[in-house]
Interface confidence: medium
Amino acid sequence: SERCDDWGLDTMRQIQVFEDEPARIKCPLFEHFLKFNYSTAHSAGLTLIWYWTRQDRDLEEPINFRLPENRISKEKDVLWFRPTLLNDTGNYTCMLRNTTYCSKVAFPLEVVQKDSCFNSPMKLPVHKLYIEYGIQRITCPNVDGYFPSSVKPTITWYMGCYKIQNFNNVIPEGMNLSFLIAFISNNGNYTCVVTYPENGRTFHLTRTLTVKVVGSPKNAVPPVIHSPNDHVVYEKEPGEELLIPCTVYFSFLMDSRNEVWWTIDGKKPDDIPIDVTINESISHSRTEDETRTQILSIKKVTSEDLKRSYVCHARSAKGEVAKAATVKQKVPAPRYTVELACGFGATGSGSGSHHHHHH
């Protein structure tokens, strides 16, 4: 047979469908690999062929389109299951060809079981809602193309295992679920079950997504540097370890990149000829506000290092801020004999001002 452009196994499209539900799967060739659509290919005399490899088998075999009630069928560039069975799991290939042209791609299809509370190994999309932001909606995903607009399906919404009815702030509105005002207790998995008739049979589509309530843009502020601050002085003797934490609070901002970095004498630590290590930790609030801490560490600080300028910088989509750490060389306490000889008669020791020391 003639050479075929083989795009291999497209693992980017890990298609998961529920057992005993309809599934429509478009051939990925036209969506991601070729620059023309199915109609153009069909007009040019190209034929779309489907075959598959069962789970744990190497043998490619044709798809049986002659099953009772046309359980598996093809319509244009879509492979239909009405409905799926567990043993439909495998790698499916669609091949576009004529006598002079051939292109094919394979993709994995996993038929997944769910329990009565819609729990399953299905990877769930995440939808973020802003806390206390007014009415926001989620829409039952991936149901287009399953039934014509003349068919009026029934849609039931669930939170976890519970049918959504008489919830304080969540109202089902057909394909949409409206959150009058979103609270953190609205976090969770939401499932829409779409029921529609087709040729005397009733089919169900189950779609689950995860709602995560996040900080509202109306409450978002530029980064806030909690440390270093004016209350803390890093006073060290040469040879001691210098540890300065830079702790920054970032409001949640959709698609914002939160950055924290140190400069020493205006340069990145990598560009300074001293042995500096920086360790970062990140924590999140219940609304995905972020606290980043970068601890700057110099194991054995020198007198020269204690004269340098250490500045913590932070940036988000809301702005950029910076704060310098107050670093000083500790003045050794005068020895008692010297005190007497010099006639100071001091009773205390140290610098006479109050310091917090971070270790």
Partner: antibody
Framework: QLQLQESGPGLVKPSETLSLTCTVS??????????WGWIRQPPGKGLEWIGS???????DYNPSLKSRVSISVDTSKNQFSLKLSSVTAADTAVYYC??????????????WGQGNLVTVSS | DIQLTQSPSFLSASVGDRVTITCRAS??????LAWYQQKPGKAPKLLIY???TLQSGVPSRFSGSGSGTEFTLTISSLQPEDFATYYC?????????FGGGTKVEIK
Amino acid sequence: QLQLQESGPGLVKPSETLSLTCTVSGGSISSSTYYWGWIRQPPGKGLEWIGSIYFTGSTDYNPSLKSRVSISVDTSKNQFSLKLSSVTAADTAVYYCAKEDDSSGYYSFDYWGQGNLVTVSS
Amino acid sequence: DIQLTQSPSFLSASVGDRVTITCRASQGISSYLAWYQQKPGKAPKLLIYAASTLQSGVPSRFSGSGSGTEFTLTISSLQPEDFATYYCQQVNSYPLTFGGGTKVEIK
């Protein structure tokens, strides 16, 4: 008026499992803006959050107790329960159940049970 | 975990005094802070939530302020029934944590 009432044994032997139930009256445990929590207070000491549950069964636990703690909810009985396994004398405390209200978006334990003193001793 | 440090631990005051209790968080918690009052042998009672919002039914002599890492509970004029232990609690992130408490005693 919402009320919470803890029930369960006041004495548990070391290495056994502590079991407490909180019965909610005057309101539904299935309200969509409430979490239900357990907090404990050793004699003469401060408060420690053990964990919280939502009516759907979703839980959050204090990492310091996570390996030993389990919180469950029974919406039909309007109750939620705490189980703490492998107890030691350090688990002796007054155990409170409480409602965490989210309707302001800011949370707080606005209703508490009267507390149940559990002593771990052989 | 977010640590909450309350100060002072003990406070002696007289009826009519203005009393201030401070709660410092180990990291920024926005306004996700509540204040509770606890009397011996009783469950804690919510006074303030969202750092500064007075819980329904709580006398207006109680007020809360602060945001980020520094928070304050103020009793403008101490009454006999206010002698108790006060706790702050952060609800910003899990695990939820409480301050160590401030005991307000009669001078």
